[in-house]
Interface confidence: medium
């Protein structure tokens, strides 16, 4: 026997209290698939998060981060502070890369300069906090 709830489309829920009638999702909620017995609460992009895509009755809101921060995790579950190029984020905030390391992005960690001699090459351009060395012949 077919479940009557399977006829309820996305954007609705199957209301068992009203003879399994398809009721619209309340505002600030959504159902992305048919046949659901409740709607899901929309994600709220608050604080350091900002709204990239509004919630609709059939799809959740999507968040990104305010300027000065970048997304981390699936679906931008966290916002992490940006640093300048030549820095990395530590527990004590943004710190300059140590000598011999660089970071050419506003996120991530400082990485060691390439060791040109391992490939039998010499340093053509010296590295900086922001840029890796350039190896030459």
């Amino acid at each position: 026997l077919q479940d009557p709830c399977s006829n309820c489309p996305a954007g609705t829920f199957c209301d068992n209290n009203r003879n399994q009638i398809c009721s619209p999702c309340p505002p600030n909620s959504f159902s992305s698939a048919g046949g659901q017995r409740t709607c899901d609460i929309c994600r709220q992009c608050k604080g350091v998060f900002r709204t990239r895509k509004e919630c609709s009755s059939t799809s959740n809101a999507e968040c990104d981060c305010t300027p000065g921060f970048h997304c981390l995790g699936a679906g931008c579950s966290m916002c992490e502070q940006d640093c300048k190029q030549g820095q990395e984020l530590t527990k004590k905030g943004c710190k300059d890369c140590c000598f011999g390391t660089f970071n050419d992005q506003k996120r991530g960690i400082c990485r060691p300069w390439t060791n040109c001699s391992l490939d039998g090459k010499s340093v053509l351009v010296n590295g900086t906090k922001e840029r890796d060395v350039v190896c030459g012949p």
Epitope: R18, S23, P26, R37, T38, C39, D40, I41
Partner: nanobody, 122 residues
């Protein structure tokens, strides 16, 4: 026991106005998320408007925005829907609705009332 009693419906000409009331008992409307849902003849339920949380944020379906106003009187524990510039397509049974939040993160409407009929016709 939670009860919702709608009133104020009737027959009105296009362009006219009506004010629907929903008297609530068994819960405090100022502490809950509440709103209005309607069902036109032969159609499914359609969400109309809501007033959410103690801050009183209001929300409207696109089809009624600028014409309908939701409000509440906390002292009377009553929810209102002021409807103006009514159109034939507003003809429906209007239900007062309370949000129900579920442990798993879902939300549904609790429609306890019998509804009030609004007919817009010349």
């Amino acid at each position: 026991e939670v009860q919702l009693l709608e009133s104020g419906g009737g027959l009105v000409q296009p362009g006219g106005s009506l004010r629907l009331s929903c008297a609530a008992s068994g819960f405090t409307i100022s502490a809950e998320d509440v709103g209005w849902v309607r069902q036109a003849p032969g159609k499914g339920l359609e969400w109309v408007s809501a007033i959410l949380d103690s801050g009183g944020s209001t929300y409207y379906a696109e089809s009624v925005k600028g014409r309908f106003t939701i409000s509440r009187d906390n002292a009377k524990n009553t929810l209102y829907l002021q409807m103006s510039s009514l159109r034939a397509e507003d003809t429906a049974v209007y239900y007062c609705a309370r949000y129900v939040y579920h442990a798993g993160g879902g939300v549904t409407f609790d429609l306890r009332g019998q509804g009030t009929q609004v007919t817009v016709s010349s």
